[in-house]
Interface confidence: low
């Protein structure tokens, strides 16, 4: 398997997609695991629903979610609030019994905050205090943030 690189920004969500042959892997649950060393084991992070027919339901383990489009043949993993320690080698797997087939090897790269040129206490840009003002938000409904989570881009 070639390794596919997915780049994400610190504090941002990263979506990893793993395409597969839906017929070949029909009825199989999927998993996302982290490679421990070049030749070490792949440590399970999260797997799809125990009932294969419910694989489309998103399952979370901490800040990592998995969902499977079993008809379209695409496994999607979401890494929320990406952090530098999330960088590394991962695998998308198809499970059958105690065995696991590798669907895709993934290298996750975490890029630094692109707006990190602000000094401590500064706002986003040197002129931000003059350029920004209160904005009207229409019927704003959004997911709640985890305590301490800083969505991208963070404020200083």
């Amino acid at each position: 398997h070639n390794t596919t690189v997915f780049q994400g920004v610190a504090g941002q969500s990263l979506q990893v997609s793993c395409p597969y042959d839906s017929m070949k892997h029909w009825g199989r649950r999927k998993a996302w695991c982290r490679q421990l060393g070049e030749k070490g084991p792949c440590q399970r992070v999260v797997s799809t629903h125990n009932l294969w027919l419910l694989s489309f339901l998103r399952r979370w383990n901490g800040s990592t979610a998995i969902t499977d489009d079993t008809l379209g043949g695409t496994l999607t993993i979401t890494l929320r609030n990406l952090q530098p320690h999330d960088a590394g080698l991962y695998q998308c797997q198809s499970l059958h019994g105690s065995e696991a087939d590798t669907l895709r090897k993934v290298l996750v790269e975490v890029l630094a905050d692109p707006l990190d040129h602000r000094d401590a206490g500064d706002l986003w840009f040197p002129g931000e205090s003059e350029s920004f003002e209160d904005a009207h938000v229409e019927h704003s409904i959004s997911r709640s943030l985890l305590e301490g989570e800083i969505p991208f881009p963070p404020t200083s």
Epitope: A135, S140, P153
Partner: antibody, heavy 118, light 112 residues
Framework: EVQLVESGGGLVQPGGSLRLSCAAS????????MSWVRQAPGKGLEWVSV??????????GYNPSVKGRFTISRDNSKNTLYLQMNSLRAEDTAVYYC?????????WGQGTLVTVSS | DIVMTQSPDSLAVSLGERATINCQSS???????????LNWYQQKPGQPPKLLIY???TRASGVPDRFSGSGSGTDFTLTISSLQAEDVAVYYC?????????FGQGTKVEIK
């Protein structure tokens, strides 16, 4: 897959108003700064406005050329970005692009044409 | 506002040859953290712009390695090492250091 689809452009008379929309999909909308960039026919690019993310209270910033006339907003329940344009002038004639803002404008819509003419 | 000036306005290069576009800013875009806040975009006819390079020299995801960015605090260069037919486009530089964001006027690259 990240997708941005603008709508709402058209022909309007000087002094008139128009509201542009941008439907976003394929990413966590509330996490990102969103922006409008415009391009007059046969001309270059001009940044118009930006609205920050949830963590930054969705505050907005404007190019001085449109400040006081244009208002950027977002409806996070609909994953939609808006640009309310009032007191339109002939020089506002352009294709208006919605763009996501990270290291730069990393994803763009196809644009919607606004023509200000009598 | 920071003024961005590109040269030349247009450029005709043979297939497989090197294309070089210059951009100058009226203020240094080099920050004390060592990063230079200069972006390059490619816009093909009838399409929206596409981010090519950020931080002056970092290629955006999926951009071929024939595209490279270099420069100093105020003088920047986008180089296409071996021009391909699909590279015919207008290229824009943009400063990302402060408000308002400003773009260069664009450089049109054509096949000779």
């Amino acid at each position: 897959e990240v997708q941005l689809v603008e709508s709402g452009g058209g022909l309007v008379q000087p002094g008139g108003s128009l509201r542009l929309s941008c439907a976003a999909s394929g990413f966590t909308f509330t996490d990102f700064y969103m922006s409008w960039v415009r391009q007059a026919p046969g001309k270059g690019l001009e940044w118009v406005s930006v609205i920050r993310n949830k963590a930054n209270a969705y505050t907005a910033g404007y190019n001085p050329s449109v400040k006081g006339r244009f208002t950027i907003s977002r409806d996070n329940s609909k994953n939609t970005l808006y640009l309310q344009m009032n007191s339109l002038r002939a020089e506002d004639t352009a294709v208006y692009y919605c763009a996501r803002l990270t290291y730069g404008f990393d994803y763009w819509g196809q644009g919607t044409l606004v023509t200000v003419s009598s | 506002d920071i003024v961005m000036t590109q040269s030349p306005d247009s450029l005709a290069v043979s297939l497989g040859e090197r294309a070089t576009i210059n951009c100058q800013s009226s203020k240094s875009l080099l920050h004390s953290n060592g990063k230079t806040y200069l972006n390059w975009y490619q816009q093909k006819p009838g399409q929206p712009p596409k981010l090519l390079i950020y931080w002056m020299s970092t290629r955006a995801s999926g951009v071929p390695d024939r595209f490279s960015g270099s420069g100093s605090g105020t003088d920047f260069t986008l180089t296409i090492s071996s021009l391909q037919a699909e590279d015919v486009a207008v290229y824009y530089c943009q400063q990302f250091l402060e408000f308002p964001f400003t773009f260069g006027q664009g450089t049109k690259v054509e096949i000779k």
